[in-house]
Amino acid sequence: LNTTVLQGMAGQSLRVSCTYDALKHWGRRKAWCRQLGEEGPCQRVVSTHGVWLLAFLKKRNGSTVIADDTLAGTVTITLKNLQAGDAGLYQCQSLRGREAEVLQKVLVEVLEDPLDDQDAGDLWVPEESSSFEGAQVEHSTSRNQETSFPPTS
């Protein structure tokens, strides 16, 4: 699966859009998780509304917000007030029961605000208006079309 690299400025908001086949993923909730290490588990950060019909409503966990346009097939995640500690590898997931299918892998990079090193005076930008989608760099790997369910305990 391709990895998309997104860069955001510290203190601002970073918006991530993951697209998917709306029919294939009909009725499925979506989630945003943070990968713990290269091969480690993906720790759930936030998921869409429990009632799939209400997936368009924004759901928040701390500074992360998720909303799903199930007709268009786009799930949008917003990382607000981006901090250096938010940098890392994330996944957009489609949930089929407890099975999570990876829709997209996203590498978030946080750029230091150059204003941090100078006296910015009273200059500030309202958080809501400073959304940054960043440059995308894709690392290609082949997608295995035939997968078996992982063993469950």
């Epitope: 086949d21 294939k24 029961g97 407890r98 079309q145």
Partner: antibody, heavy 122, light 108 residues
Framework: EVQLVQSGAEVKKPGESLKISCKGS????????IGWVRQMPGKGLEWMGI????????RYSPSFQGQVTISADKSISTAYLQWSSLKASDTAMYYC???????????????WGQGTMVTVSS | EIVLTQSPGTLSLSPGERATLSCRAS???????LAWYQQKPGQAPRLLIY???SRATGIPDRFSGSGSGTDFTLTISRLEPEDFAVYYC?????????FGGGTKVEIK
């Protein structure tokens, strides 16, 4: 009318190959996942695997992984279940079924084929 | 994998009586992913209930589903002659999806 029509009964010898089919009609075949379910004589239902005809994304139950191959040809709205080397224990009724996703995220097989009886005997 | 245990294995009742079928899961199952099917001899299964309690299209209201967690129930309020069949529960919550062993409802 929404329906799934399966190919006819088959009698095969152990070691032979086989491909059975399931043709969908009355709906957009690429809009729903299609599953395969096995029912051995006098027994219950077993979930084998599922395919999304739109892109042929396929999932298998661990019990059937490597034993069968599920495929689809969206141009003719048909899903397939195949064996490269049949065993006597493959004797069973095989059903294809359409998976419906309902408004609240529920999943269930809402439309079933009539079944294909596969008999493997020397 | 999640094991679904249905009980009783066979239920002997007369037309007009109430039938209560149980489906117990080896671990918790989300209600959204629990379905019930009816199968008559020589026929394919038919969807009765999805989401633990929602009736499928064309299913009479004498069929109802309930339950959550590990215990689910299918109730047929008044048995009609055509209701004598085998009933299966199925979960889609955990991979791989699994079916219960079935409950046969037979005429007493």
């Amino acid at each position: 009318e929404v329906q799934l029509v399966q190919s006819g009964a088959e009698v095969k010898k152990p070691g032979e190959s086989l491909k059975i089919s399931c043709k969908g009609s009355g709906y957009s075949f690429t809009s729903n996942w299609i599953g395969w379910v096995r029912q051995m004589p006098g027994k219950g239902l077993e979930w084998m695997g599922i395919i999304y005809p739109g892109d042929s994304d396929t999932r298998y139950s661990p019990s059937f992984q490597g034993q069968v191959t599920i495929s689809a040809d969206k141009s003719i709205s048909t899903a397939y279940l195949q064996w490269s080397s049949l065993k006597a224990s493959d004797t069973a009724m095989y059903y294809c079924a359409r998976e419906a996703g309902y408004d609240y995220g529920e999943l269930a097989f809402d439309i079933w084929g009539q079944g294909t009886m596969v008999t493997v005997s020397s | 994998e999640i094991v679904l245990t249905q009980s009783p294995g066979t239920l002997s009742l007369s037309p007009g009586e109430r039938a209560t079928l149980s489906c117990r899961a080896s671990q918790s199952v989300s209600s959204s992913y629990l379905a019930w099917y009816q199968q008559k001899p020589g026929q394919a299964p038919r969807l009765l209930i999805y989401g633990a309690s929602s009736r499928a299209t064309g299913i009479p209201d004498r069929f109802s589903g309930s339950g959550s967690g590990t215990d689910f129930t299918l109730t047929i309020s008044r048995l009609e002659p055509e209701d004598f069949a085998v009933y299966y529960c199925q979960q889609h919550d955990s991979s791989p999806p699994t079916f219960g062993g079935g409950t046969k409802v037979e005429i007493k």
